[in-house]
């Protein structure tokens, strides 16, 4: 069952998923000047069974210039920088590392993909938060959020994380910079 809304936003933090539960949608979004092809699903779907899951449908982007029934209105300013090659490589490495029953790995990037990935998560999905570069965790309980079903409604639990700015990165004594996700599992690129 799809979660009704997106995971909570934490100032100066991003969230990541280790793997994606079956039923998760990943919108086929394209970078500026490109749009998804007119035939094919508007999203990829994590589908399968308990022994094997994979992403159904493939996202494809095409140049927007050649579309006669598609118009482009005044573009909004770019909000994010291009995803770096190293980040793309880390995604592909992740695909070899994560294998959870009933879950899909991070899909590899597609040509002319947008800078931000937009997911529709399902009930039971956990996402993990970490502070962006230049900020550190000032107060940390579980830095994660879970989509739960309560009384027929979905809700995300509130992550216990505050990210504070600093001129030089530093940690509390004995606290490592939160690079790896809980349980030592590798983390994946996500929509925030």
């Amino acid at each position: 069952e799809l979660c009704d809304d997106d995971p909570p936003k934490i100032t100066h933090a991003t969230f990541k998923a280790v793997a994606y539960k079956e039923g998760t949608m990943l919108n086929c979004e394209c970078k500026r000047g490109f749009r998804r092809i007119k035939s094919g699903s508007p999203y990829m779907l994590c589908t399968g069974n308990s022994s094997h899951s994979s992403w159904d449908n493939q996202c494809q982007c095409t140049s927007s210039a050649a579309r006669n029934t598609t118009k482009q209105v005044t573009p909004q300013p770019e909000e994010q920088k291009e995803r770096k090659t190293t980040e793309m490589q880390s995604q592909m490495q992740l695909a070899d590392q994560v294998s959870l029953p009933g879950h899909c790995r991070e899909p590899p990037p597609w040509e002319n993909e947008a800078t931000e990935r937009i997911y529709h998560f399902v009930v039971g999905q956990t996402v993990y938060y970490q502070c962006v570069q230049g900020y550190r965790a000032l107060h940390r309980g579980p830095a994660e959020s879970v989509c739960k079903m309560t009384h027929g409604k979905t809700r995300w639990t509130q992550p216990q994380l505050i990210c504070t700015g600093e001129t030089e990165p530093s940690q509390f004594p004995g606290e490592e910079e939160p690079q790896a996700s809980p349980d030592g599992l590798p983390e994946s690129e996500t929509s925030r």
């Epitope: 799809l2 809304d5 997106d6 039923g23 949608m25 919108n27 979004e29 394209c30 500026r32 749009r35 007119k38 035939s39 094919g40 699903s41 508007p42 999203y43 779907l45 589908t47 159904d56 449908n57 927007s64 029934t69 598609t70 118009k71 482009q72 209105v73 005044t74 573009p75 909004q76 947008a114 931000e116 937009i118 529709h120 929509s191």
Partner: antibody, heavy 114, light 107 residues
């Protein structure tokens, strides 16, 4: 809570235009396509087109090209649809829809009458 | 354009029964099909996406199945509140198209 709040009913004259709104709340407006659907009794549901507020892209069902104009204002998280050269055939309920058709507005009833 | 055909405009059933609403696409749409429920005077409500996945809050008595051109929405243990019109929709290619609807009547 995700909501799509549409503007109120319109009674308009043939040959004129009408512009209706769809205000989104509870999600990142610029991330998701907003579609528009027409419903007339006995004619079922018809997809008019959709707009990506962040990317600025618009798709029209060719049947509605020249009839419908879709716009969006990211600063107010509001999508708009203007219908022009109205005839009795345009009398219908118009719905906005977002987040891969998961969320629907309550609809705007347009009545075209002399 | 892809035509989505719901051959039965009306279906009659009793509380507790099992009923299947069918939808046929004029060409292969994979599993890119959604089902909606519309009660009188209300907006359509999304029930199923990708042919077989339920939206949140949708009772598990609603089940979607099918791929390619033939799709089915099955309602098991029909309840009185299921009195509504049911629409299928393909979103495999533009323009997205809907079926004509099937009205479920409770005896």
């Amino acid at each position: 809570q995700i909501q799509l709040q549409q503007s109120g009913a319109e009674l308009v004259r043939p040959g004129t235009s009408v512009k209706m709104s769809c205000k989104a709340a509870g999600y990142t407006f610029s991330n998701y396509w907003i579609g528009w659907v027409k419903q007339r009794p006995g004619h079922g549901l018809e997809w008019i087109g959709d707009i990506h507020p962040g990317g600025g892209y618009i798709n029209y069902n060719e049947k509605f090209t020249g009839k419908a104009t879709l716009t969006a204002d990211t600063s107010s998280s509001t999508a708009y649809m203007q219908l022009s050269s109205l005839t009795s055939e345009d009398s219908a309920i118009y719905y906005c829809v977002s987040r891969n058709f998961a969320n629907w507005g309550q609809g705007t009833l347009v009545t075209v009458s002399a | 354009d892809i035509v989505m055909s719901q051959s039965q405009k009306f279906m009659s059933t009793s509380v507790g029964d099992r009923v299947s609403v069918t939808c046929k696409a004029s060409q292969n749409v994979g599993t890119n099909v959604a089902w909606y429920q519309q009660k009188p005077g209300q907006s359509p409500k999304a029930l199923i996406y990708s042919a077989s996945y339920r939206y949140s809050g949708v009772p598990d008595r609603f089940t979607g199945s099918g791929s390619g051109t033939d799709f089915t929405l099955t309602i098991s243990n029909v309840q009185s509140e299921d009195l509504a019109e049911y629409f299928c929709q393909q979103y495999n290619s533009y323009p997205y198209t809907f079926g004509g609807g099937t009205k479920l009547e409770i005896k």
